[in-house]
């Protein structure tokens, strides 16, 4: 079936090697001829010619294909010229001949086992395969082709990408360790629970791809979508030469959705226990899972064991807010935390949603800060608050919001990073509500906003002349 891959080979006598320890040669004859008419002879320099045993197969609408598989591994030698010629024994004529090097006619068999599953990030796909001839895998390069599996559109976009074996897994980067230096102190954090869905579409050849031996990671796919994928290999052209082998049989994989869609938020209050919460779906039950992974080059735990995240009672603090499911688990500070939420709908269909991985120190939620105030002069307030965490005072940023009585819109202020207070100019003879919240956003610790402090009611004094 791989013969078509040799179409560009203009030689009438075509030869290929699967593992560089074997050699198959074949040629086609349009004209029917009895068995024994042809002989394929071969010889290495200064050696006696030998005949390669021929088999033949009928080719519909063409004639006969004559095939020889070299019978002995010792007859297949690299880096020596091999002289081959086809002889019409009956007519005692040479029909065709060629000289080749076995090391330049590789046509590798496709990877024999290919497994695919969601990676550690939403929109990521982890692929691993087994090389039929492991001893030559170092001398091969791989190409992946994949596309969205859309039953309605069988001609969906296809991406073909060369796998860069020299690149290791992107999981090396600390997950979402966004530098806070070039942001305002309280800029929206690039935290797992606030990441917007990726816009990279598989129809664009922009998806990142990395590999290590028999595995690679694709990113930039659409979370929640189904994909098909195939793999093939080619000699690297440096040590060994040849052509691209055939594509492996397609495998399909369903990527987990992005847990952003469920409003997943995880946090720790004590750097030991992690709580995760997500919006409860209508007419569905849900369950959280987690696992820890070490920071390393390419993932060894390609098939992680997800542990149950212990369920908490469902909360419904207000009718306006959606009902949340919560669960908690004990964590460690030396590993990356991965979260998966499984939602089971009434008919029993299970949908998986993957959170973006994070370190525990990236999910520290501060206690609600206490806000104190005093009016220095009419409408002029002096505000003060205690750092909820003295150990991270320089990494804590705050947001203060206030609104006039009867108003719905809030004005939000962001004091400088690490500030313990500030002043606020309000209108005299007015009533206000003030709230404060805190968040870690430094090089060591990050996390989500705390809840807003209870509203502090302020009534500013009448103006007085100095």
């Amino acid at each position: 079936q791989d013969v078509s891959l040799l179409a560009s080979d203009s030689e009438p006598l075509k030869c290929f090697s699967r593992t560089f320890e074997d050699l198959t040669c074949f040629w086609d004859e349009e004209e029917a001829a009895p068995s024994g008419t042809y002989q394929l002879l071969y010889a290495y320099p200064r050696e006696k010619p030998r005949a390669c045993p021929l088999s033949s197969q009928s080719m519909p609408h063409f004639g006969t294909r004559y095939v020889c598989q070299f019978p002995d591994q010792e007859e297949v030698r690299l880096f020596f010229p091999l002289h081959l010629w086809v002889k019409n024994v009956f007519l005692n004529q040479t029909r065709t001949q060629r000289v080749l090097f076995v090391d330049s006619v590789g046509l590798p068999a496709p990877p024999s086992i290919i497994k695919a599953m969601g990676g550690s990030q939403p929109g990521e796909l982890q692929i691993s395969w087994e090389e039929p001839a492991p001893e030559i895998s170092d001398f091969l390069r791989y190409e992946l082709r994949y596309g969205p599996r859309d039953p309605k559109n069988s001609t969906g976009p296809t991406v073909i990408q060369l796998i860069a074996t020299e690149t290791c897994c992107p999981a090396l980067q600390r997950p979402h360790s966004a530098s806070a230096l070039d942001q305002s102190p309280c800029a929206q954090p690039t935290m797992p629970w606030q990441d917007g869905p990726k816009q990279t579409s598989p129809s664009r050849e922009a998806s990142a791809l990395t590999a290590e031996g028999g595995s690679c990671l694709i990113s930039g796919l659409q979370p929640g979508n189904s994909y098909w994928l195939q793999l093939r290999s080619e000699p690297d052209g440096i040590s060994l030469g040849g052509s691209w082998g055939s594509w492996s049989l397609p495998v399909t994989v369903d990527l987990p959705g992005d847990a952003v869609a469920l409003g997943l938020q995880c946090f720790t209050l004590d750097l030991k226990n992690v709580t995760c919460q997500w919006q409860q779906q209508d007419h569905a039950s849900s369950q959280g899972f987690f696992y820890h992974s070490r920071a390393r080059c390419c993932p060894r735990d390609r098939y992680p064991i997800w542990e149950n995240c212990e369920e908490e009672e469902k909360t419904n603090p207000g009718l306006q807010t959606p009902q949340f499911s919560r669960c908690h688990f004990k964590s460690r500070n030396d590993s990356i935390i991965h979260i998966l939420v499984e939602v089971t709908t009434a008919p029993g269909t299970v949908h998986s949603y993957l959170g973006s991985p994070f370190w525990i120190h990236q999910a520290v939620r501060l206690p609600t800060p206490n806000l104190h105030w005093r009016e220095i002069s009419s409408g002029h307030l002096e505000l003060e608050w205690q750092h909820p965490s003295s150990w991270a005072a320089q990494e804590t940023c705050y947001q203060l919001r206030y609104t006039g009585e009867g108003h719905q819109d809030w004005k939000v202020l962001e004091p400088p990073l690490g500030a313990r207070g500030g002043t606020l100019e309000l209108r005299p003879r007015s009533r206000y509500r003030l709230q404060l919240r805190a968040r870690l956003n430094g090089p060591t610790y990050q996390g989500p906003w705390s809840s807003w402090s209870d509203p502090t009611r302020v009534e500013t004094a009448t103006e007085t002349a100095w």
Epitope: E30, E31, A32, A33, P34, S35, G36, V89, F90, N92
Partner: antibody
Framework: EVQLVESGGGLVQPKGSLKLSCAAS????????MNWVRQAPGKGLEWIAH??????????YYADSVKDRFSISRDASENILFLQMNNLKTEDTAMYYC???????????WGQGTSVTVSS | QIVLTQSPAIMSASPGEKVTISCSAS?????MYWYQQKPGSSPKPWIY???NLASGVPARFSGSGSGTSYSLTISNMEAEDAAAYYC?????????FGGGTKLEVK
């Protein structure tokens, strides 16, 4: 169904000429090698001429007994095989068969034959 | 060229009898081919590649041999088997036929 129908035989004087034809049907004529085989009365079979397929440039081969006197050719568009016989001898008297070369048999389909008599 | 010698040239056998026709080559050949010819008809392909029966050939026929010695055998002769049998080599140019064996029914 493969069919080979010879024609053109008859009585001819020694040193005379005759052209035999063989109309082929039921197969892809140009992809097969073709032969002429003859059988003298009461004798065995003798191969006399061979012409290869189009992919082998219609190369021709002859038995020593007819070389330089007989010529095999084919009309690729009309699916006809010819045998031009010149300088005929009495020993050329025989039944002449048009035969297709096959994969299992060197000669897998035979025509019904056409009779050639060389006599003065 | 390779000369094929068939023996016997003529033979007769009774129905049910075992018949063997030999074909000897002047030099070694890979395969032998056999054809059957009845009076007034053109030859029919009968056995290919030494031992394979052509389509429609009764199973009482068999072929064997190697190198320079080949044979066609009829395990139990039937009246319809009366015919001339020719061996053919296609090992080296030119192809040659044996002189034929005429088989008659007693």
């Amino acid at each position: 169904e493969v069919q080979l129908v010879e024609s053109g035989g008859g009585l001819v004087q020694p040193k005379g000429s005759l052209k035999l034809s063989c109309a082929a049907s039921g197969f892809s004529f140009n992809t097969y090698a073709m032969n002429w085989v003859r059988q003298a009365p009461g004798k065995g079979l003798e191969w006399i001429a061979h012409i290869r397929s189009k992919s082998n440039n219609f190369a021709t081969y002859y038995a020593d007994s007819v070389k330089d006197r007989f010529s095999i050719s084919r009309d690729a568009s009309e699916n006809i095989l010819f045998l031009q016989m010149n300088n005929l001898k009495t020993e050329d008297t025989a039944m002449y068969y048009c035969v297709r070369q096959g994969g299992d048999f060197p000669m897998d389909y035979w025509g019904q034959g056409t009779s050639v008599t060389v006599s003065s | 060229q390779i000369v094929l010698t068939q023996s016997p040239a003529i033979m007769s056998a009774s129905p049910g009898e075992k018949v063997t026709i030999s074909c000897s080559a002047s030099s070694s050949v890979s395969y032998m081919y056999w054809y059957q010819q009845k009076p007034g008809s053109s030859p029919k392909p009968w056995i290919y590649r030494t031992s394979n029966l052509a389509s429609g050939v009764p199973a009482r026929f068999s072929g064997s041999g190697s190198g320079t010695s080949y044979s066609l055998t009829i395990s139990n002769m039937e009246a319809e088997d009366a015919a001339a049998y020719y061996c053919q080599q296609y090992h080296s140019y030119p192809t040659t036929f044996g002189g034929g064996t005429k088989l008659e029914v007693k």
